[in-house]
């Protein structure tokens, strides 16, 4: 009996389409692999960005696979081709692996690059990213902002940059259709007479960096002696009212009586008929239905009741 | 309909230099690997360079290693070869190839004729 | 280098009959050979690879066999328009080489 051997992949690369971190990685079928015509060859797929402790596994009768990654960092990639032990009458064949790396060359020292980037999805509406050039920088560096996401053909520059004493700091990004749950990718790079500028690389979801407004038309409703309802409306624009947590901050008589986090638009409040100044302020933010992090918004304007019993009569602002 | 058209090709002298183009449609060109062959006046073909889908493997037989450089844009879908220090056995009819799964030759362009020759 | 060899540079045939064009490695390229056709002022068109499988489009009147160092391509039921030079190729290592050329004649 001959021992059946199946060859690893070839050609196996890391392809770059300029997508600012979404990598294809592409193979060609190994050779000889028409003695296996009828079995299904499958690929074992395992990569990572260089520095990672953990590799990405996939299994895949395909020739290709995409995902994103750290352009920041370096990547590097294994593949090999299994025959499942249908075709072998036995145990599982495996060729040798093929391996292969990529990373772009950096330019710059790291001190160049922009320094704290934030970005904030306002509302779920309006997408602004401010940074801070990079340490010993002279003026006449600017940075140029790119971003592309899944649906865009191409990566795209931003048209509408914040700018201070000349300098690109921010950008204040168009109506970005259908992208959100889905990553997004951004380079920060940067041009100067005078010295290199080595680039940045981002990658966050929309729907994670949403920035919601405060909530509006705060109310206090009495309930019984001794209970108020406090009410309030989820605060106008897109986002949908299961998505939002909300934090309410409650004051008695200049006292912080009750720091409450609710999911709905009302809170019950126990209270003494003593109570003669009753306020509070409620913020929002995006749940983790909807969402795996978020910005709480602003506290919304302070709505009070005071001088007359709260028992009396409900009370509206 | 996978289509590939050569062009570039002409008459020049020996040491000098010649860039043929190839352009690719039919198919997505990023997948796949492609080939420049040649076809000499006595009618032997002679692989002259291959290039992975990707562009980040490179192919040569020695006879040209060195003086031909494959490349390719996928943005554009267009292959090329450039070809320095030419020689009068570079005179060829050259053909554009996309090459298939398996490392054969599935479609070819028409070809571009070069001629070396003072 | 591998060098693919097709001894028989001309064959002559009638149309109907069977003809078998052979190639051989000068070593062993498993199944690793395409063969290809090109009729006069065309360029080359993919007939077989893997040794014995046809490009999809391709006649069952053409059949690849062989593996190692000898490889054969048949055509059955030779038509005129099979008038052609038949190429063998192999790509189990670089550099990818061809054999000679057959050219097919039609009495």
């Known amino acids: 009996d001959t021992e059946i051997k199946v060859n690893p992949p070839q050609d196996f690369e890391i392809v770059d389409p300029g997508y600012l971190g979404y990598l294809y990685l592409q193979w060609q079928p190994p050779l000889s692999l028409d003695h296996f015509k009828e079995c299904t060859v499958e690929y074992e797929l395992k990569y990572r960005n260089i520095g990672s402790e953990t590799w990405k596994t996939i299994i895949t009768k395909n020739l290709h696979y995409k995902d994103g990654f750290d352009l920041n960092k370096g990547i590097e990639a294994k593949i090999h081709t299994l025959l499942p032990w249908q075709c072998t009458n036995g145990s599982e064949v495996q060729s040798s692996w093929a391996e292969t790396t990529y990373w772009i060359s950096p330019q710059g020292i790291p001190e160049t690059k922009v320094q704290d980037m934030d970005c904030v999805y306002y509302n779920w509406q309006y997408l602004l990213c401010s940074w801070k050039p990079g340490i010993g920088v002279l003026l006449d560096t600017n940075y140029n902002l790119f971003y592309w996401y899944e649906g865009l053909d191409h990566a795209l520059q931003c048209v509408d940059y914040i700018k201070a004493d000349g300098q690109n700091i921010g950008c204040r990004f168009p109506y970005l259709e259908a992208s959100d749950y889905k990553d997004f990718y951004i380079c920060v790079n940067g041009s100067s007479e005078n010295k290199p500028i080595r680039s940045s690389y981002f990658t966050f979801q929309l729907q994670n960096i949403v920035k919601p407004l405060p909530p509006v038309y705060l109310t206090f409703t009495r309930e019984s002696s001794c209970e108020i309802k406090l009410k309030w409306s989820i605060p106008l624009g897109p986002i949908p009212a299961r998505c939002f947590d909300y934090e309410i901050e409650i004051r008695e008589d200049d006292t912080t009586l009750v720091t409450a986090t609710v999911e709905n638009e009302t809170y019950t409040l126990k209270t003494t008929n003593e109570t003669r100044q009753l306020c509070f302020v409620v913020r929002s933010k995006v749940n983790i239905y909807c969402s795996d992090d978020g910005i709480w918004s602003e506290w919304s304007d302070k709505q009070c009741w005071e001088g007359e019993d709260l028992s009396k009569k409900t009370l509206l602002r | 309909e996978v289509k590939l058209v050569e062009s570039g090709g002409g008459l020049v002298k020996p040491g000098g230099s010649l860039k043929l183009s190839c352009a690719a449609s039919?198919?997505?060109?990023?997948?796949?690997?492609m080939s420049w062959v040649r076809q000499t006046p006595e009618k032997r073909l002679e692989w002259v360079a291959t290039?992975?889908?990707?562009?980040?493997?490179?192919y040569y037989p020695d006879s040209v290693k060195g003086r031909f450089t494959i490349s390719r844009d996928n943005a554009r879908n267009n292959l090329y070869l450039q070809m320095n220090s030419l020689r009068s056995e570079d005179t060829a009819l050259y053909y554009c190839a996309r090459r298939d799964l398996r490392s054969a030759m599935d479609y070819w362009g028409q070809g571009t004729s070069v001629t070396v020759s003072s | 280098d591998i060098v693919m060899t097709q001894s028989q540079k001309f064959m002559s045939t009638s149309v109907g009959d069977r003809v078998s064009v052979t190639c051989k490695a000068s070593q062993n390229v498993d199944i690793n050979v395409a063969w290809y056709q090109q009729k006069p002022g065309q360029s080359p068109k993919a007939l077989i690879y893997?040794?014995?499988y046809r490009y999809s489009g391709v006649p069952d009147r053409f059949t690849g066999s062989g593996s190692g160092t000898d490889f054969t391509l048949t055509i059955s039921n030779v038509q005129s328009e099979d008038l052609a030079e038949f190429f063998c190729?192999?790509?189990?290592?670089?550099?990818?080489?061809f054999g000679g050329g057959t050219k097919l004649e039609i009495k």
């Open positions: 190729q192999q790509y189990n290592s670089y550099p990818l080489t």
């Open positions: 893997s040794a014995s």
């Open positions: 290039i992975s889908g990707g562009g980040s493997y490179t």
């Open positions: 039919g198919f997505t060109f990023s997948s796949y690997g």
